[in-house]
Amino acid sequence: ETVHCDLQPVGPERGEVTYTTSQVSKGCVAQAPNAILEVHVLFLEFPTGPSQLELTLQASKQNGTWPREVLLVLSVNSSVFLHLQALGIPLHLAYNSSLVTFQEPPGVNTTELPSFPKTQILEWAAERGPITSAAELNDPQSILLRLGQAQGSLSFCMLEASQDMGRTLEWRPRTPALVRGCHLEGVAGHKEAHILRVLPGHSAGPRTVTVKVELSCAPGDLDAVLILQGPPYVSWLIDANHNMQIWTTGEYSFKIFPEKNIRGFKLPDTPQGLLGEARMLNASIVASFVELPLASIVSLHASSCGGRLQTS
């Protein structure tokens, strides 16, 4: 049976969802264990400049020593103010100095990146050493690059569409996810549903998605259900500032009791089916409905509190 609930975009003051993901439009990860230099290449596209970017490089000591030297090739299409964190990492940074401005002196070796097209930048980087990772990101707000983490099964890095960078790279898009909402016809009361649908990724290893839910309501004002649907290999770690009904696929646990796993349910994997689930749980309002790529952290901020739904 069709559920009558006309999903419409919700204004950011009513609900906003940001997320961190390893999914990239194009990318690759490879193992180059004997390389003198660990080479990483980032192609960053910004729709409008100038943009701000936070770029963090993390490395763990291996056998008590810092990792080998790292070359990070940063290719951008417009002006960027860069906040770089790479403490203790022997980093060489290749970038276009006319486009990248540091918020504070980088304290690393820098090289001018020739103004080549993408293919030649990859060739230029590869001349210097085997590429461990390469990725294309659209309008990132922050990037975390983990060094010495490459889990790639390939011995070489060939850019391919729609890749999961695993632990090597996580990033947060500047643009929040599209949040939609609707009224479920024929349901009385003020119970609201927050539905988060995580789409399958490009590698099917077990994943935990941390879901932070911040609802700006007085504790007694809320009657809500959180519906989390994702592929079978996803489990959920929920960090919520309110008590609410939880309805998930896979398993879930709460941040306050992370070791206590609770078995979820088999949920439909279509928007219509999830709206039907919300209706079955007696929700009268879908305060937020969000579809996301496979993410590691999702933050939902909402201020609906069972009040009137406002769409933009």
Epitope: T119, E123, A125, E127, R128, G129, C157
Partner: antibody
């Protein structure tokens, strides 16, 4: 299957020009640059230059800047090399080769070669 | 330009014999690449990043070296290995090849 098919042998007179071609197939041309290498009778290899199919950007070895002009026709996935003011020193086999960043930017596929003979 | 000198220019080896040829760079390079060329054929990528075998290259081949001195080794010569081998560098412009080592069967 990746293929680089070069035009046939050429016999030309000194002082003239010649344009040889390299038709590519089996891969996305904008993801690789295409290069030209000269092999003279003494069998040594000499890199001439390369071209990017994406924007037609070229890089040349200094000594070939006035000798060779590299161009591409994206619609037919074909690269061209024109050699001008030919002398007997230009008699050689010319190869086109694709560059692969994932193999260290080495030349992973080569054309079969075009033999150029400059003779009066 | 960075001149690559290969030695010996010509060598012969018996089947089953271990073969080593060298490539010396006039300026230090980070990696060398090796190509195999048989008579009247195009060169083939054989070894990249000094020691990585290209797809289809038999495991009896290996490459090593650093700085100015690099080598290609065949652990046990086979008939199909008779060819000319060229080393190449990319790190200094222009890209240069060595003069080649011609390997014949004794």
């Amino acid at each position: 299957e990746v293929q680089l098919e070069q035009s046939g042998p050429e016999v030309v007179k000194p002082g003239t020009s010649v344009k040889i071609s390299c038709k590519t197939s089996g891969y996305t041309i904008t993801e690789h640059t295409l290069h030209w290498i000269k092999q003279n009778q003494g069998k040594s290899l000499e890199w001439i230059g390369g071209i990017n199919f994406d924007n037609g950007g070229t890089t040349y070895r200094q000594k070939f800047k006035d000798k060779a002009t590299l161009t591409v026709d994206k619609s037919s996935s074909t690269a061209f090399m024109e050699l001008r003011s030919l002398t007997s020193d230009d008699s050689a086999v010319y190869f086109c080769a694709r560059r692969a960043y994932y193999y260290g930017s080495a030349f992973d596929y080569w054309g079969q070669g075009t033999t150029l003979t400059v003779s009066s | 330009e960075n001149v690559l000198t290969q030695s010996p220019a010509i060598m012969s080896a018996s089947l089953g014999e271990k073969v080593t040829m060298t490539c010396r760079a006039s300026s230090s390079v980070n990696y060398v690449y090796w190509y195999q060329q048989k008579s009247d054929a195009s060169p083939k990528l054989w070894i990249y990043y000094t020691s990585n075998l290209a797809p289809g290259v038999p495991a009896r081949f290996s490459g090593s070296g650093s700085g100015n001195s690099y080598s290609l080794t065949i652990s046990s010569m086979e008939g199909e290995d008779a060819a000319t081998y060229y080393c190449q560098q990319f790190i200094s412009f222009p890209y240069t090849f060595g003069g080649g080592t011609k390997l014949e069967i004794k």
